[in-house]
């Protein structure tokens, strides 16, 4: 059974992940972003279901495409290099979903824009955090 300290750690990791995803969204979904129109042409796979930490496997599998889109951004728009930002997210995702169980991600039929994709995972983090508090 999860202890209060492990629950607190999970909550802090989710909050960190949430802030990272929100920060990326803020850098993209903005009228000052010269590459917004181009970025919105890229398609991302959305999870069929995302209600548990193991479903973060679906986010992990889309981190490489996410990094590629972020590489389009001007360097002044991101004070962290996309590679470092995605690396940070990857570390948190791996810790949260755990590596002991292998989960095959199921994707929805419809693809999404980068904004829809980020909003989906932001909602996921907020939802899990609310169950922990």
């Amino acid at each position: 059974a999860p202890t209060s300290s492990s629950t607190k750690k999970t909550q802090l990791q989710l909050e960190h992940l949430l802030l990272d995803l929100q920060m990326i969204l803020n850098g993209i979904n903005n009228y000052k972003n010269p590459k917004l129109t181009r970025m919105l042409t890229f398609k991302f796979y959305m999870p069929k279901k995302a209600t548990e930490l193991k479903h973060l496997q679906c986010l992990e599998e889309e981190l490489k495409p996410l990094e590629e889109v972020l590489n389009l951004a001007q360097s002044k728009n991101f004070h962290l290099r996309p590679r470092d930002l995605i690396s940070n997210i990857n570390v948190i995702v791996l810790e949260l979903k755990g590596s002991e169980t292998t989960f095959m991600c199921e994707y929805a039929d419809e693809t999404a824009t980068i904004v829809e994709f980020l909003n989906r995972w932001i909602t996921f983090c907020q939802s899990i955090i609310s169950t922990l508090t």
Epitope: Q22, N30, K32, N77
Partner: antibody, heavy 121, light 111 residues
């Protein structure tokens, strides 16, 4: 001095069109992004649209998308808002505001006095 | 869209006394460039809005130093150290981290 002066407001019937203008003076107009923001009677502020300094990018609030068009003529130092298919809920004071975000982003640092649009049958 | 929530709706203040307005965003306003694009605007009766503060706490030119801003992430505060008669009006917080949205406004009036 730095100034933005809106014009073109008036009373118009639902479904009709109107074009607002915003004349800029006292600064290098072509260096600034420009916004339209509106304020319904007795209500708060609502962002309407933005256009880049060179006109290359334009974005709209969902409430006006497909009906309003923002444009600019840098040779005339003028910003425009073409409003089609007007509705009663478009009744508001319309302000233009400037924003420079390439060097030092102060936000919307200069606002016009506003022009009133009333949509009524 | 990022939703901006201001409190209180109205703030009756005694001249010379401090006033404080809170603004909360539905989403962190920290941009990927490291800045937080949160501004405060003042609208005096019958006047257009006027920029007071930008990027949380930076006073715009000509703004008296009795106005100050603080906060981070999702929670922000505008403080007027000693309210003067000319400060009467409606104050709005505004974010331009994503597409612009405004708080509902806080009316500052003299008791």
């Amino acid at each position: 001095q730095v100034q933005l002066v809106e014009s073109g407001g008036g009373v118009v019937q639902p479904g009709r069109s109107l074009r607002l203008s915003c004349a800029a003076s006292g600064f290098t107009f072509s260096s600034y992004g420009m916004h339209w923001v509106r304020q319904a009677p007795g209500k708060g502020l609502e962002w309407v649209a933005v256009i880049w300094y060179d006109g290359s990018n334009k974005y709209y609030a969902d409430s006006v998308k497909g009906r309003f068009t923002i444009s600019r003529d840098n040779s005339k130092n003028t910003l425009y808002l073409q409003m089609n298919s007007l509705r009663a809920e478009d009744t508001a004071v319309y302000y233009c505001a400037r924003e420079e975000w390439e060097l030092e982003d102060y936000g919307m640092d200069v606002w016009g006095q506003g022009t009133t649009v009333t949509v009524s049958s | 869209d990022i939703v901006m929530t201001q409190t209180p709706l109205s703030s009756p203040v005694t001249l010379g006394q401090p006033a404080s307005i809170s603004c909360r965003s539905s989403h962190s306003l920290v941009h990927s460039d490291g800045h937080t694009y949160l501004s405060w605007l003042q609208q005096r009766p019958g006047q257009p809005p006027r920029l007071l503060l930008y990027k949380i706490s930076n006073r715009f030119s000509g703004v008296p130093d009795r106005f100050s801003g603080s906060g981070a992430g999702t929670d922000f505060t505008l403080k007027i150290s000693r309210v003067e008669a000319e400060d009467v009006g409606v104050y709005y917080c505004m974010q331009t981290t994503q597409f612009p949205t405004f708080g509902g406004g806080t009316k500052v009036e003299i008791k």
